[in-house]
């Protein structure tokens, strides 16, 4: 996890998320996500 | 409801191996991916690796990546850790944890059932 300040005094924190794929299809392996400030982007 | 229990610990030399089991109590044992965590004395509990209900797909944490293999037996309702290659860094109790599937399985809250854990000391 990596924490970036910024020169606004806010925080924003980003926090690798990992899903497996089987779980929302038939593909096998992982799904490799960001949440930034609590709302996943990518 | 999935009860959990870990065995396999114990003290091992650097380079050593263990093989840790962790065996489940409960009808819905296929229906969880199933994680192991560790935590070392005064540190946060760290992930380690993940396995999805069917088995198929695996994740490994950083620190063991290629040293650490998951593994699962939906029959006999049993996760596996084989560590090898071990070196001291990797002492800590070692957690088996049942996650809802769909849900992040690197992170702690997505695990709903957690076991009492298994000490792993890596030590000459």
């Known amino acids: 996890d990596a924490e970036f300040r910024h020169d606004s005094g806010y925080e924003v924190h980003h926090q690798k998320l990992v899903f497996f794929a089987e779980d929302v299809g038939s593909n096998k392996g992982a799904i490799i996500g960001l949440m930034v400030g609590g709302v996943v982007i990518a | 409801e999935v009860q959990l229990v870990e065995s396999g610990g114990g003290l091992v030399q650097p380079g050593g191996s263990l093989r840790l089991s962790c065996a489940a109590s409960?009808?819905?044992?296929?229906?969880?991916?199933m994680g192991w965590f560790r935590q070392a004395p005064g540190k946060e509990r760290e992930f380690v690796a993940a396995?999805?209900?069917?088995?198929?797909?695996?994740y490994y944490g950083d620190s063991v990546k290629g040293r650490f293999t998951i593994s699962r037996d939906n029959a006999k309702k049993t996760v596996y850790l084989q560590m090898n290659s071990l070196k001291p860094e990797d002492t800590a109790v070692y957690h088996c944890a049942a996650a809802r599937f769909g849900t992040p399985i690197n992170t702690r809250g997505s695990y709903d059932y957690w076991g009492q854990g298994t000490q792993v000391t890596v030590s000459s």
């Open positions: 396995i999805s209900r069917s088995g198929s797909s695996t």
């Open positions: 409960g009808r819905t044992f296929s229906i969880y991916n």
